[in-house]
């Protein structure tokens, strides 16, 4: 065992000189041994035992999609950026992975579930935790003060991920964000309308969006006694409540964060109300929360906030949620989170949430953390959770037994007769080059029936059927495929009604 | 077990000859690169020449090329050093070496070593 | 040419006694780096491989570390049989050069 471990590290190191001497250009010759040497190095390895023994697997936490996963990502993905684009927003990309650098000191406790990269070379890498510290970093970098943008993208996590529950290690994030100074919360009404809009729009059941202030947490934290430093622990504690009872919740601030026990309570006196713009209005009254500025300023703009999400007709969705503690560090105003809303079992319960779908807020900080002379530029943003809304539609589907098309074939070339390959090569050639999704059979003389078949599998509503007659007289046989009518088609008019039958433009524009 | 057993060695003068062989046993002699390294009387070690499995890599130190020669015949399991123009400073014990790994210039097995003077 | 330079040149150690010998070479070699040991009138031994790999038969108490430009062989717990001049080879490029040697002696 302990030879073959030497032996592969001399295969490293030996694959290490090649290429150094490559890169140094050295003599061919040189260059000729040094390869003749790792490949004897190579064969001497020979097989691996233990690839016997290897599993053929995924990573954990990641996940193939087959064609029918990949026919409703690609669903959902449209859904979603067609209502990005229909609010304005650019579209940009970043790397997979990050200088380390930039993403320390951004996440608080779930720094520790960064992916980072082995050694490359001298930088020290990460892999991306999300998008949002990417876009602060390229805003900074190309001194950007002003963007809508959208950015639809995997990033990775080295959770402990529940797959079944649409949780992964990788996983792709929908992200929309405005950056810029502008008059308050008009922005961040417009990501709660998007967030609105997007999840009504995918149908996946009744959801309820829980808004919340970091200011107001902060400014409640320091009225209940908590100090400074203990702020952000205790946020991660609070953030908690949607999944766990308020005794839990209790018990891990006093236990395992030492927080006092009456401090404590002062705080499960205000974290476990929820309501509307009403709350706000109560909260505005609170005699100690009213004195604290911070939590004054987020009130205030919270009550801005709902007399536009009513104007957008959407406030009947949000919630304002004192519980809701979003845990990543560079929050630093309004932040909200959708839930998917599962129907009570009894008339009368409240509903019951089912964990997020879609979630965002405001980070007026972020940007200046890269830039040398700390110059701010205001953001706010959301995510939606796609990975999840994924694993929703797809149980739905299947419930439905409901059959989903993965490729776009509009028609199948068909022949009736033997020896007219040449001929199906022609049209299918024809339809392609007049933007047509057509297919055929890779056989020479495939059977009529096999060729319906296929059609039936894939879901194809048409065949175009050559025959020796249909040439002799220039037309072309067009068949439904449900219905099982035929139509003689003039060769010239079948690109056309192919496309007024699948109903698509007539020019390719 | 792996063996070499170094012969040739002996006085020589100033600008003579001589040719060592090292006969190797116990391994598939063919598949290895082999070589020659010297150690002069109270001295340290000097990697010579070496020469690859099929013979067609061959190198030598700065102070013998163009005066030695390495060459092998793996029908017969052996490795030789043609020495010319031998020089005083050439006197030492000459090790034949067999590489680690077929290929890794580290002598993994040694011969006892054969004693080369070059005296007037 | 690569330079090999060993450090000490001599020690002078007890049975038991933790020795440490280093080897210096005068360009980086990755990991490219032997140690041998020679008892006098006999041909040196192999005693580790690229930096850290133990030879099959050497005794545990012999290891080595480093990589780059600096390397270290360490004798945990010296036995009678270690006395002997110990040489460290970079085995990165041709001419494939020796250190000096380091001579350890009983004290």
């Known amino acids: 065992m302990a030879e073959r471990a030497a032996l592969e590290e001399l295969v490293k190191l030996q694959g290490e000189r090649v290429r150094g001497l490559k890169q140094q250009k050295a003599s061919a010759e040189l260059i000729e041994e040094e390869v003749a040497k790792l490949l004897k190095l190579k064969a001497q390895l020979g097989p691996d035992e233990s690839k016997q023994k290897f599993v053929l697997k995924t990573p954990k936490g990641t996940r193939d999609y087959s064609p029918r996963q990949m026919a409703v990502r690609e669903k959902v993905f449209d859904v979603i950026i067609r209502c990005f684009k229909r609010h304005g927003a650019e579209v940009i990309d970043t790397p997979v992975f990050e200088l380390k650098e930039t993403l320390m000191g951004k996440y608080g406790e779930d720094s520790k579930l960064i992916y980072d990269l082995k050694d490359q070379g001298g930088e020290l890498l990460s892999l991306r935790y999300d998008l949002t510290v990417p876009f602060a970093r390229y805003l900074a970098m190309n001194k950007l003060t002003n963007i809508k943008r959208y950015h639809i993208a995997k990033v990775y996590r080295r959770d402990n991920p529940a797959m079944t529950r649409g949780r992964y290690r990788e996983f792709y994030q929908c992200d929309f964000d405005i950056a810029g100074n502008f008059d308050p919360m008009i922005p961040d009404a417009e990501c709660l309308k998007i967030m609105c809009e997007i999840l009504s729009s995918l149908q996946i059941g009744d959801f309820l969006v829980k808004v919340n202030d970091r200011r107001i947490l902060d400014g409640m934290f320091a009225i209940c006694g908590v100090s400074d430093s203990k702020f952000r622990t205790i946020c991660s504690s609070v953030d908690k409540l949607d999944k766990v009872s308020w005794e839990e919740v209790k018990n891990e601030m006093v236990g395992e964060k030492g927080l006092a026990p009456e401090v404590a309570d002062r705080i499960g006196d205000y974290v476990q109300q929820h309501g509307g713009v009403s709350l706000v209005e109560q909260l505005l009254q609170d005699p100690k929360l009213s004195q604290n500025k911070q939590a004054l300023e987020g009130l205030g703009d919270l009550k801005l906030l709902f007399e536009y999400l009513t104007l957008f007709g959407i406030d009947d969705k949000i919630s304002f949620d004192l519980s809701l503690a979003r845990g990543l560090d560079y929050y630093t105003g309004v932040i909200y989170e959708a839930v998917l809303l599962q129907t009570p079992a009894q008339a009368g319960e409240e509903p019951l949430g089912v964990g997020s779908v879609a979630a965002g807020g405001r980070y007026d900080g972020l940007v200046g953390m890269f830039d040398p002379k700390g110059r701010k530029v205001p953001c706010v943003g959301l995510s939606i959770g796609v990975e999840r809304i994924f694993s929703i539609v797809e149980q739905r589907l299947e419930a439905l037994e409901e059959k989903i098309r993965t490729t776009e074939t509009q028609v199948l070339v068909a022949s009736a007769q033997k020896k007219l390959l040449e001929e199906r090569l022609k049209l299918v050639s024809e339809l392609w080059d007049a933007g047509i999704k057509a297919e055929l059979l890779y056989k020479k003389n495939p059977k009529l029936l096999n060729q319906l078949q296929y059609c039936e599998e894939a879901g194809i509503p048409l065949v175009a059927i050559i025959g020796e007659q249909e040439l002799k007289d220039g037309v072309i046989k067009l068949r439904s495929v449900t219905s099982r009518e035929e139509v003689d088609v003039r060769r010239e008019d079948l690109v056309e009604e192919i496309k007024r039958r699948t109903g698509q433009p007539l020019c390719i524009c | 077990q792996v063996q070499l057993v170094e012969s040739g060695g002996g006085l020589v003068k100033p600008g003579g000859s001589l040719r060592l062989s090292c006969a190797a046993s116990?391994?598939?002699?063919?598949?290895?690169?082999m070589s020659w390294i010297r150690q002069a009387p109270g001295k340290g070690l000097e990697w010579v020449s070496y020469?690859?499995?099929?013979?067609?890599?061959?190198n030598y130190a700065d102070s013998v090329r163009g005066r030695f020669t390495i060459s092998r015949d793996n029908a017969k399991n052996s490795l030789y050093l043609q020495m010319n123009s031998l020089r005083a400073e050439d006197t030492a014990v000459y090790y034949c070496?067999?590489?680690?790994?077929?290929?890794?210039?580290?002598?993994?097995?040694w011969g006892q070593g054969t004693l080369v003077t070059v005296s007037s | 040419d690569i330079q090999m330079t060993q450090s000490p040149s001599s020690v002078s150690a007890s049975v038991g006694d933790r020795v440490t010998i280093t080897c210096r070479a005068s360009?980086?070699?990755?990991?490219?780096l032997a140690w041998f040991q020679q008892k006098p009138g006999k041909a040196p031994k192999l005693l580790i491989y690229?930096?850290?790999n133990l030879e099959s038969g050497v005794p545990s108490r012999f290891s080595g570390s480093g990589s780059g430009t600096d390397f270290t062989l360490t004798i945990s717990s010296l036995q009678p049989e270690d006395f002997a001049t110990y040489y460290c080879?970079?085995?990165?490029?041709?001419?494939?050069?020796f250190g000096q040697g380091t001579k350890l002696e009983i004290k």
């Open positions: 690229v930096a850290s």
């Open positions: 360009q980086g070699i990755s990991s490219w």
């Open positions: 070496a067999r590489y680690l790994y077929q290929v890794i210039a580290i002598a993994k097995s």
């Open positions: 020469i690859s499995d099929s013979s067609r890599y061959t």
């Open positions: 116990g391994f598939t002699f063919s598949d290895y690169y």
């Open positions: 080879q970079q085995a990165n490029s041709f001419p494939y050069t």
